[in-house]
Interface confidence: medium
């Protein structure tokens, strides 16, 4: 029906306004409405202009695009004639009454087409329905996926590419991971992956300063190390260093007027030489304090060496050896008194006798034929050597004796002179003043090692060597090694150290074998005024401990491997150190600082004298150990 | 839009051969990954064979179960994927779905092709 | 070889309930892949990479993993989600499914 209108509208339009000519009301008759007819009646008078002749030829030569006035005025109604949809976004045109309705391809909208949907922007279609990356595009859009991921079927989802599994060979050495969008070569701890090797390296912490002192980088990571003989351990963070502290402070007062008899390892401690009238006989009193009990207290010797006089210890009895030109004797008598007391000591040379007394009591008297030193040029000349001799007379002496002695002396009076002149050297010289109050045991001040050759063979055995080791400890600190055997190599293959504990105020016990531990006594509370004993004992199948808590046979899968290490050692030559060790590399032991704290040692049956160490630091005190400070209401 | 369609399939008996096709539409085919998957009432769902595009030579990869007796080989210019059948068994029976893998999944599958091997 | 486990291997569910199945494998390395099928149709890419929804899979549905257990959810059951769902790994040649578990209306 409505094409029907549409013909009949035509061809009245051809008679009416072709044929003929036609004013506005008679193309109002043949529109027969309004809009149509004022929008059709403007754009028909140009095409009679353009189409009569005259004025507009020119005109329509140049401008109109229809041949003849028919064609002109045919197309005045077609509202889609010229087309004003927008050509890339229309489907479709439609003429209207005086208007046109542009039918838009999906992508497109706006009343001609001429907008662009962006389709990544929907709010009811979010994203597109891309589940990555949506790309608007004109008049439609696409999905894509980043790096690393590839496309669905669907065109709308990406999937991660598993580049594990598509190149296996993809990170070389190390451990592929997959992760979305991309892979990881993954590396253990400690290497770091290598992109033009395609491997794992070895990262080298200590060229990053990981470490406050020492560090020591192994394949797959590093160790920190603290000077322990500087005083420093390493801190809970493994990587710092902090002070070892006194968990037992000791009262280490000293007086000049108490003279230390031990200051020196190997030499005397004090020499004098006297120049008296001839008439002088010799003399010596003093008061002397030992837990020792053998070693030198005095030597006097003439001037050329032909006489000498020796006062002594042995067994904790004064002992005298003599020799001149008329005799040679040795006598040992009196109380014991390496007590740890002061003891009164009095040696006087008489007309036929030398007494000796202790507390003002005669204990011994020595018959001499004439005097002991022998005057000349109306002088007596006398050397007078204190906690030791000159080392040509161990030679001479009518038996031999360990020189080294620890004690003090004080009140002293030689060849009637008084202490005058010798108290003046003294003070100037702290390391000759003695302690004031002292204990029986061993002292480790923390600053040296005492070496000893102990052979462990035993032949009777089956099991070739064997260590064992009773140790009586009274730790100032909570940090130091307390025995070390120690290879020609500089290895370490057997250490027994402290180290404090994790737990507060107590200490561990290590037992290590070179940088392994081999086993640890947790949480001791050893850090106190009473001794702890610890016991072990090891050969190369077995290792046994006990401590004030409990004794144990130690096994575990590592240690057969471990006690493999320590009896090849064994079979080879090994140092017995205690205190300390000495010049090895730090990553030798786990605990490299200087035991502090008074020690004793048994081992394999014999008690260790510090004076038959081969070699011992100076101020280890073999026979003393300072009194455990006591807080007083005034200090 | 993705169309895969399998042919070939029917009644073989036990020692027998069967070729298999499939025709892909849709999609770049000689860049994809294509594949095939059985499922049986008694094996359930069963990769088979697979055979990667041009950019990875076509290689081909296959179940143990069948190495040695079953090749997949394609066609690219006719956008084909076949699956050449020997020495046939009876578990051997079930659908077979020629598949279009995207990244070790099965991303678009076929509606299947019905083997059944029986004496 | 993997071998996938899925449990439980029926199971019905009422309209409006939540749905969990599970799948179990050895390795938590690799992603999951979950098919949905219908009877007389091939199946279905559902959930891909563990738990990436395929475009026009309904938001109801949901994927995780906690350790080597990997699970399908459906938060409120409906009448077309009634399938075998199939759960699918690779961690190198061959391809594993697992044994499906049939969902059933209730």
């Known amino acids: 029906a409505n094409s029907l209108l549409e013909e009949t509208k035509q061809g009245n339009l051809e008679r009416e306004c072709i044929e003929e000519l036609c004013n506005k009301e008679e193309a109002r008759e043949v529109f027969e409405n309004d809009p149509e007819t004022d929008y059709f009646y403007p754009k028909y008078l140009v095409c009679l202009r353009s189409f009569q002749t005259g004025l507009f030829t020119a005109a329509r030569q140049s401008t109109n695009a229809y041949p003849d006035l028919r064609s002109c005025v045919n197309a005045i109604p077609d509202q889609c004639s010229p087309l004003p949809c927008n050509e890339d976004g229309y489907m479709s045109c439609k003429d209207g009454k005086a208007s046109f309705t542009c039918t838009c391809k999906p992508g497109w909208q706006g009343e001609k087409c001429e907008f662009d949907i962006n389709e990544c922007k929907d709010p009811s279609n979010i994203n597109g329905g891309c589940s990555q990356i949506c790309d608007n595009t004109p008049g439609s859009y696409h999905c894509s996926c980043k790096n690393g991921f590839v496309m669905l079927s669907n065109k709308k989802d990406c999937k991660d590419v598993d580049e594990c599994s598509l190149k296996p060979s993809i990170c070389g050495t190390a451990v592929c991971k997959n992760i979305p969008g991309d892979f990881e070569c993954e590396c253990p701890e400690g290497y770091r992956y290598n992109l033009k090797s395609k491997s794992c390296e070895d990262i080298d912490e200590c060229s990053e300063n990981m470490c406050a002192q020492l560090c020591v980088n192994y394949p797959g990571g590093y160790t920190c190390y603290c000077d322990g003989k500087k005083g420093f351990k390493l801190a809970q963070d493994q990587k710092s260093c902090e002070v070892v502290s006194v968990c037992l402070p000791l009262n280490l007062d000293t007086k000049y007027e108490l003279l230390y008899l031990a200051e020196q390892f190997a030499g005397v401690v004090l020499y004098l030489k006297f120049r008296l009238p001839e008439i002088s006989r010799f003399s010596a009193e003093f008061d002397f304090r030992t837990y020792d009990s053998e070693g030198v207290i005095l030597y006097a010797e003439s001037i050329d060496h032909s006489a000498w006089l020796l006062i002594a210890l042995r067994g904790g009895k004064i002992e005298v050896q003599l020799k001149n030109e008329h005799t040679s004797k040795i006598t040992t008598g009196g109380d014991v008194i390496n007590n740890g007391l002061w003891n009164m000591v009095s040696v006087e040379e008489l007309e036929h006798s030398i007494s000796i007394k202790i507390a003002k009591e005669a204990v011994m008297d020595i018959n001499k034929p004439g005097p002991l030193f022998k005057p000349e040029n109306g002088l007596l000349e006398t050397k007078v050597y204190f906690a030791g001799f000159p080392r040509k007379v161990e030679s001479e002496l009518i038996k031999p004796i360990n020189p080294r002695l620890d004690g003090c002396i004080r009140s002293w009076n030689l060849m009637k002179q008084g202490a005058s002149g010798i108290k003046e050297i003294i003070q100037e010289k702290q390391n000759k003043h003695c302690l004031v109050t002292v204990e029986k045991g061993s002292y480790y001040p923390g600053s040296g090692i005492a070496q000893f050759h102990i052979d462990y063979n035993n032949v009777s055995s089956a099991e070739g060597w064997h260590v064992n080791v009773t140790l009586n400890i009274r730790p100032s600190t909570g940090t130091g090694v307390m025995l070390a055997l120690v290879s020609g190599n500089n290895t370490v293959p057997f250490a027994v150290s402290l180290v404090d504990s994790t737990s507060e105020k107590s200490q561990d016990i290590l037992l290590s074998v070179e940088n392994t531990v081999i086993y640890r006594i947790q949480a001791l509370s050893l850090c106190s005024d009473q001794q702890s004993h610890l016991e072990f004992r090891v050969n190369r199948n077995n290792l046994e401990l006990s401590t004030p808590l409990k004794i144990e046979t130690i096994s575990h899968e590592d240690l057969q491997r471990q006690l493999a290490v320590l009896d090849k050692a064994m079979k080879a030559k090994v140092a017995t150190y205690l205190g300390g060790l000495p010049d090895v590399p730090f990553s030798a032991t786990p605990v490299n600082a200087f035991y502090n704290g008074c020690m004793e040692v048994n081992i394999n049956g014999v008690q260790l004298d510090l004076d038959e160490a081969i070699s011992k630091h100076n101020d280890i005190r073999a026979h003393s150990c300072p009194s455990v400070w006591k807080k007083t209401k005034n200090s | 839009e993705v169309k895969l369609e399998e042919s070939g399939g029917g009644l073989v008996q036990p020692g027998g051969s069967m070729k298999l096709s499939c025709a892909a539409s849709?999609?770049?085919?000689?860049?994809?990954?294509m594949g095939w998957v059985r499922q049986s009432p008694e094996k359930g769902l069963e990769w088979v064979a697979e055979i990667r595009g041009k950019a990875n030579n076509h290689a081909t990869y296959y179940s143990e179960s069948v190495k040695g007796r079953f090749t997949i080989s394609r066609d690219d210019s006719k956008s084909s994927v076949y699956l050449q059948m020997n020495s046939l068994r009876a578990e051997d029976t079930g659908i077979f779905y020629c598949?279009?893998?995207?990244?070790?999944?099965?991303?678009?599958w076929g509606q299947g092709t019905t083997l059944t091997v029986s004496s | 070889q993997i071998v996938l486990t899925q449990s439980p291997a029926i199971m019905s569910a009422s309209p409006g309930e939540k749905v969990t199945m599970t799948c179990s494998g050895r390795s938590s390395e690799n992603y999951m892949y979950w098919y949905q099928q219908k009877p007389g149709s091939p199946p279905r890419l559902w959930i891909y990479?563990?738990?990436n929804l395929v475009s026009g899979v309904p938001a109801r549905f949901s994927g995780s993993r906690s350790g080597t257990s990997y699970s399908l959810t459906i938060s409120s059951m409906e009448a077309e989600d009634a399938a075998t769902y199939y759960c699918q790994q690779f961690n190198g040649y061959p391809y594993t499914f697992g044994g499906g578990t049939k969902l059933e209306i209730r």
């Open positions: 598949c279009l893998i995207t990244a070790f999944l099965f991303d678009y």
């Open positions: 990479d563990t738990s």
């Open positions: 849709g999609f770049t085919f000689s860049d994809a990954w």
